[in-house]
């Protein structure tokens, strides 16, 4: 008699997760009588997948009717494939006995499962960073197979290059995860900017998955401060304004100090947004010149988004304003926008508040 052959024609089969996998197996002879069993893996630790003779295998069905006369087709279909089903499957012929005796195994069919990556999740820094600093964004996607995957980062459509990407595990696995970190330099114009993590995989048919993060959640744009004095009014009052411009987020507190003493504190709220996503705010202070003998040092102190206060000071020189005159004062207006105080020398007299 010709020796029995157990034929598994496919060396490998690739199936999308959720689909059914057909594993083919035929025997070359009806002899000897005995069952076929399917196993995943070889050796003592192999896992029984299907036994024609006995057992309950709800996800496995015989492709050919096992009661068909002279049946030599022992192919099986496994439904609802998951990445955990990946492995090498062996069709094994047994000789009928008590118990049945293993006779011959097929060469094995490797089942690989194509599993889609999960939607990429992009997370930014835990705390805001100031413009002109670099921050890190991470992107994670899980559960894909095979291991080959492409991940790209974009900022406003431009690909980022300062990127570090890892796929885990390094060895063979039923499914894989990817984690990537991109370092992004924030600019003052980035309030409306977006970073995109784009994942391409064989299971996605050329339609990559994207995860996004808005830089508005990561960025802080500090304000510019400018303190100016308007023309002297007929009633000897000078209007001093503090212009706070181009800041983000809106969380801002402004305090006027007169000769170092707190005069008024205001909180920004419901401000209109600039085109670039930043905000502007102006606060006015009316100073009654005739009520002052000495020069008055006015300070506009701005605390933005919990950061250390930024001050701009302005000195009003009372001597430059005769009390009976209502003429304009030539103001010396110098200084910088910085933390701490800068003196802006100008002339004015005693002050009076007015607040918008």
């Amino acid at each position: 008699e010709e020796e029995l052959q157990v034929i598994q024609p496919e060396k490998s089969v690739s199936v999308a997760a959720g689909d059914s996998a057909t594993l083919n197996c035929t025997v070359s002879s009806l002899i000897p009588v005995g069952p076929i069993q399917w196993f995943r893996g070889a050796g003592p630790g192999r896992e029984l997948i299907y036994n024609l003779k006995e057992g309950h295998f709800p996800r496995v069905t015989a492709v050919s009717d096992p009661t068909k006369r002279n049946n030599m087709d022992f192919s099986i279909r496994i439904s609802n494939i998951t990445p955990a089903d990946a492995g090498t499957y062996y069709c094994v012929k047994f000789r009928k006995g008590s118990p049945d005796v293993e006779l011959k195994s097929g060469a094995g069919t490797e089942l690989s499962v194509r599993a889609k990556p999960s939607a990429p999740v992009v997370s930014g820094p835990a705390v805001r960073a100031t413009a002109e600093h670099t921050v890190s964004f991470t992107c994670e996607s899980h559960g894909f197979s095979p291991r080959d995957i492409t991940l790209k980062w974009f900022k406003n459509g431009n690909e980022l290059s300062d990127v570090q990407t890892n796929v885990d595990p390094a060895g063979k696995s039923v499914s894989y995860s990817i984690r990537s970190t991109a370092r992004v330099l924030l600019t003052r114009r980035d309030v409306h900017s977006q970073v995109i993590c784009e994942v391409a995989h064989v299971t996605l048919q050329g339609d990559p998955l994207r995860g996004t993060a808005n830089l508005s959640e990561a960025i802080r744009v500090p304000p510019f401060l400018e303190v100016t004095q308007q023309s002297m009014r007929a009633d000897n009052q000078v209007n001093v304004t503090c212009q706070v411009t181009k800041f983000y987020p809106q969380r801002l507190q402004l305090t006027w100090l007169e000769n170092g003493n707190v005069s008024r504190t205001e909180m920004a709220s419901a401000l209109p947004e600039n085109k670039d996503g930043t905000y502007n705010w102006t606060s006015w202070l009316l100073v009654n010149v005739s009520a002052h003998r000495d020069d008055v040092k006015l300070t506009c102190q701005v605390e933005h988004d919990g950061q250390p206060a930024v001050n701009k000071s302005f000195s009003v020189k009372v001597s430059a304003h005769p009390k009976e005159q209502g003429s304009n004062t030539a103001a010396e207006n110098t200084g910088t926008n910085e933390r701490g105080s800068s003196d802006y020398k100008d002339d004015d007299d005693k002050h009076h508040h007015h607040h918008h």
Epitope: L30, V33, G34, N51, L52, P66, T67, R69, N70
Partner: antibody, heavy 119, light 110 residues
């Protein structure tokens, strides 16, 4: 271990019917044919019919086609053979047997059920 | 229907001697390279037991003193050295189409 356990002996009057059961264990009932064979006292083996429990497909010996009916209950892995219009020459041991190789052979047998038809 | 005829109807053989039983089919029982003949042994008070399938293949647990041969229409069951426990009735069965049995051969010790 494949086992086929048959129901107990029956005594029937001519013209009556008998239903013999065969409870299978130790294998997947729906994957193998069940045959029914009888043996009159001192006589040879006579094939009656066979049934595929997965879909109840049956094949009958022409001699028994009009009088025998095979059924199965897959929930209890039990096969049944009913023989109607009994005559005295139906007195025999009735065997169920499982076809393990799908070759229309009889690999495993029950111990038999004696049916006696007598007035 | 295919009719199977066994010969002889009964046979007496000495212990240790060869016993040969023949089975002739009314037409060929061969198909696709296989001979659809099966041999059974039945001892008193017991159900039959499969000995040989597809003419020449020993079923599991059957002693190798039993063998089967033949093709087409003529088949033989041979016991090379008769043992006391081999006393039984032997039946051939075909499954070229729906099964039928031969009439049986009674084997006794001489």
């Amino acid at each position: 271990q494949v086992q086929l356990v048959q129901s107990g002996a029956e005594v029937k009057k001519p013209g009556a019917s008998v239903k013999v059961s065969c409870k299978a264990s130790g294998y997947t009932f729906t994957n193998y044919w069940i045959n029914w064979v009888r043996q009159a006292p001192g006589q040879g083996l006579e094939w009656i019919a066979m049934i595929d429990p997965s879909d109840s497909e049956t094949h009958y010996n022409q001699i028994f086609k009009d009088r025998a009916t095979l059924t199965t209950d897959t929930s209890t892995s039990t096969a049944y053979m009913e023989l109607r219009s009994l005559r005295s020459d139906d007195t025999a041991v009735y065997y169920c047997a499982m076809d393990y190789g799908s070759l229309y052979a009889m690999d495993y047998w029950g111990r038999g059920t004696l049916v006696t038809v007598s007035s | 229907d295919i009719v199977l005829t066994q010969s002889p109807d009964s046979l007496a053989v000495s212990l240790g001697e060869r016993a040969t039983i023949n089975c002739r089919a009314s037409k060929s029982v061969s198909s696709s390279g296989y001979n659809y003949i099966f041999w059974y042994q039945q001892k008193p008070g017991q159900p039959p037991k499969l000995l040989i399938y597809l003419a020449s293949n020993l079923d599991s647990g059957v002693p190798d003193r039993f063998s089967g041969s033949g093709s087409g229409t003529d088949f033989t069951l041979t016991i090379s050295s008769l043992q006391a426990e081999d006393v039984a009735v032997y039946y051939c069965q075909h499954s070229r189409d729906l099964p039928t049995f031969g009439q049986g051969t009674k084997l006794e010790i001489k």
